[in-house]
């Protein structure tokens, strides 16, 4: 049974091959039950979590995971060596950096050890599943009386990332957002010195090194300005 699995994980264009052994319709066996889908995410190319919904099994089952890379030097079948658990039942596998090869087709196979014919295999493009860490060290530079420049750092190759900057004044409920390319710099040409601004940034592994759909977490917010202070006096100026 070959089927295309549409998932929000950046692999919509990838055909997943499910090899599900089916039994005659008159003997309803556990073998007819589909296995849960495996979802993999590569976190900052430091480790990868491949997880599945263990509660979808009719009874608690320690499913096993094997993986390999298709048509490559790494095509030897590997057993998961670091399982993730949910209520003492396997619900995922964590792979370390040395086991991640972004630009080779990753094949992951889930199996019911009690019913070995009950297995499902998926092929994933890992470069579409990278989620970077949130941007760090946000700083604002006042370029002129009315112009601010926002800078930040990422713990990854800058050219591989695009960014989304959001800002708002005071504590409005809606954000203004702006896409930023790999240069990880954002300028706001006209700021109102009477208002207080909040900025935050998130990043995505797209489009130069991969086609990931998922954004990082938002950075910690950073603030600028206040309708009550031009800059001085500082809050704790007595201790200067």
């Amino acid at each position: 049974l070959n089927t295309t699995i549409l998932t929000p994980n950046g692999n919509e264009d990838t055909t997943a091959d499910f090899f599900l052994t089916t039994m005659p319709t008159d003997s309803l066996s556990v073998s007819t039950l589909p296995l849960p889908e495996v979802q993999c995410f590569v976190f900052n190319v430091e480790y990868m979590n491949c997880t599945w919904n263990s509660s979808s099994e009719p009874q608690p089952t320690n499913l096993t995971l094997h993986y390999w890379y298709k048509n490559s030097d790494n095509d030897k079948v590997q057993k998961c060596s670091h399982y993730l658990f949910s209520e003492e039942i396997t619900s995922g596998c964590q792979l370390q950096k040395k086991e991640i090869h972004l630009y080779q087709t990753f094949v992951v196979q889930l199996q019911d050890p009690r019913e070995p014919r009950r297995q499902a295999t998926q092929m994933l493009k890992l470069q579409n599943l990278v989620i970077p860490w949130a941007p760090e060290n946000l700083t604002l530079h006042k370029l002129s009386e009315s112009q601010l420049e926002l800078n930040w750092n990422n713990r990854f190759l800058n050219h591989c990332l695009e960014h989304l900057v959001q800002y708002r004044t005071d504590w409005d409920h809606s954000w203004t957002e702006q896409s930023v390319d790999y240069r990880h710099k954002f300028s706001l040409p006209s700021v109102d010195g009477q208002k207080r601004y909040t900025f935050r940034v998130r990043s995505r592994f797209n489009p130069l090194c991969g086609s990931a759909q998922h954004w990082s977490e938002w950075s910690h917010p950073i603030h600028w300005g206040s309708n009550t202070s031009k800059e001085n006096p500082f809050l704790f100026a007595l201790e200067a």
């Epitope: 604002l140 006042k142 603030h223 202070s229 500082f234 809050l235």
Partner: nanobody
Framework: QVQLQESGGGLVQAGGSLRLSCAAS????????MGWYRQAPGNEREPVAL???????NYPDSVKGRFTISRDTAKNTVYLQMSSLKPEDTAVYYC?????????????WGQGTLVTVSS
Amino acid sequence: QVQLQESGGGLVQAGGSLRLSCAASGITSSIYAMGWYRQAPGNEREPVALITSGDNTNYPDSVKGRFTISRDTAKNTVYLQMSSLKPEDTAVYYCYADVVIGTTYYTSWGQGTLVTVSS
């Protein structure tokens, strides 16, 4: 640089009160505003209170009238007095300081203190 250390979190019954403290150290003269955010599990970080250099304060509607922010300049400390607490106030509370050195601005963050309000 500016370092921040929160304290005062804990478990409290709904309707009760709690006071959080945030002690600033380092180049405290570069701070021009301080405040608190909070983050409940699965939610985004949201602002709770702000105090600026002129002792002006600001609060979102969700806590207005229940929370009060104040500061003790001599101790380089900001306080968040929380009263009439509700279960939905349960979150990790983070202190922050807005800092300016020359023309460069940044925001320093504490590690957070957990507040749990039981019903």
